[in-house]
């Protein structure tokens, strides 16, 4: 699975929430960022994440598609120079400071099994998705395509016009 271009084909800011409308928030604690899944108070401002979309070529020997097997990869950055990373050993989702080119752990294959929600599959561990576990983000193994509709791996994107990054 190779990224076909070093530049994203599109990017924009969005707030990320779970299928059950809990917000994904990011807090700086002891010089590192923590990721929380929580109910926000009525007028509390949602954290924004910069989503960068990249085109990726699916390996043709797996897909039988030749050059037609494109997929979308995303990186998620809630603050400058920090990106969500998949820690496949710990089954965790972490925020790490990185420089470009980003490591493979920062890329997630985009799925939408509903028209209004998305899922993020680890590039480095196919079949493993960002999900919600005990009010935190974690990596969750999905064993069949039917389970792609499982609510704990579904997220909603609330988009905004602005393209700058906080």
């Amino acid at each position: 699975m190779s990224i076909t271009g070093i530049s994203p084909i599109t990017e924009y800011l969005a707030s990320l929430s779970t299928y059950n409308d809990q917000s994904i928030t990011f807090a700086l604690e002891d010089e590192s960022y923590e990721i929380y899944v929580e109910d926000l108070k009525k007028d509390e401002k949602k954290d924004k994440v910069l989503l960068s979309y990249y085109e990726s070529q699916h390996p043709s020997n797996e897909s039988g598609d030749g050059v037609d097997g494109k997929m979308l990869m995303v990186t998620l950055s809630p603050t400058k120079d920090f990106w969500l990373h998949a820690n496949n050993k710990e089954h965790s989702v972490e925020l790490h400071k990185s420089e470009k080119p980003l490591p493979d752990q920062a890329f997630f294959v985009l799925h939408n099994m509903h028209s209004n929600s998305v899922s993020f599959e680890s590039k480095t561990d196919p079949g493993v998705f960002i999900g919600v576990k005990d009010n935190h983000l974690a990596l969750i193994k999905v064993d069949s395509s039917e389970n792609l509709s499982t609510e704990n791996i579904l997220f909603k994107l609330s988009e905004t016009h602005h393209h700058h990054h906080h």
Epitope: T10, M71, L72, M113
Partner: antibody, heavy 121, light 106 residues
Framework: EVQLVESGGGLVQPGGSLRLSCAAS????????MYWVRQAPGKGLEWVAS????????YYPDSVKGRFTISRDNAKNSLYLQMNSLRAEDTAVYYC??????????????WGQGTLVTVSS | DIQMTQSPSSLSASVGDRVTITCKAS??????LDWYQQKPGKAPKLLIY???NLQTGVPSRFSGSGSGTDFTLTISSLQPEDFATYYC????????FGGGTKVEIK
């Protein structure tokens, strides 16, 4: 090479039913969203139905909701559109289309050549 | 439901002209917008996706721009093979086509 071939169109009376088929080849069918889009004679394009790769969800505009049903058989690389209670305004060329990317409902990357459905008494 | 208003519905132009077609969404669709080209008796063809990305094989005289609610398709120098009907299409929330713009020979 990606190929989408529609069939099943024809003349049907108002109130009647018709089932369209789309045979897909040249790609991993089970990984893509699939769509039906129609075009009435001399008119523009209208989205008619969408279905997720695993057939878990389907979507329709109000104009066909409750009358049309999209389905797929991933083992047979086939897409279907069951059309019931047909009306004169359903007369159109019906196109089968494939999503541009694996797993996502963004863009209609490939289209079949269409099949004509005529609803008339 | 999101409405897509395309303008003009038709235009006459000459080979070499710069042509601009606009599409307005009834609400924010971010950059989830495509442009399709259709010639008489043929299936539509994807030209531009995610607002400004050219589909493989599409000539560079075609370009797209915009974000939010206002979008533009530009043909920098119209060629004989570009006389066709063009449709915008949003997939941010459901799926909706614009009404189409027929580009005819002046």
């Amino acid at each position: 090479e990606v190929q989408l071939v529609e069939s099943g169109g024809g003349l049907v009376q108002p109130g009647g039913s018709l089932r369209l088929s789309c045979a897909a080849s040249g790609f991993t069918f089970s990984s893509y969203w699939m769509y039906w889009v129609r075009q009435a004679p001399g008119k523009g394009l209208e989205w008619v139905a969408s279905i997720t790769p695993n057939a878990g969800e389907d979507y329709y505009p109000d104009s066909v909701k409750g009358r049309f049903t999209i389905s797929r058989d991933n083992a047979k690389n086939s897409l279907y559109l069951q059309m019931n209670s047909l009306r004169a305004e359903d007369t159109a060329v019906y196109y089968c289309a494939r999503g541009h990317y694996y797993y996502t409902s963004y863009s209609l990357g490939y289209w079949g050549q269409g099949t004509l459905v005529t609803v008339s008494s | 439901d999101i409405q897509m208003t395309q303008s003009p519905s038709s235009l006459s132009a000459s080979v070499g002209d710069r042509v601009t077609i606009t599409c307005k969404a009834s609400q924010n669709i971010n950059k989830h917008l495509d442009w399709y080209q259709q010639k008489p008796g043929k299936a539509p063809k994807l030209l531009i996706y995610f607002t400004n990305n050219l589909q493989t094989g599409v000539p560079s005289r075609f370009s797209g721009s915009g974000s939010g609610t206002d979008f533009t398709l530009t043909i920098s120098s119209l060629q004989p093979e570009d006389f066709a009907t063009y449709y915008c299409f949003q997939y941010n929330n459901g799926w909706t086509f614009g009404g189409g713009t027929k580009v005819e020979i002046k």
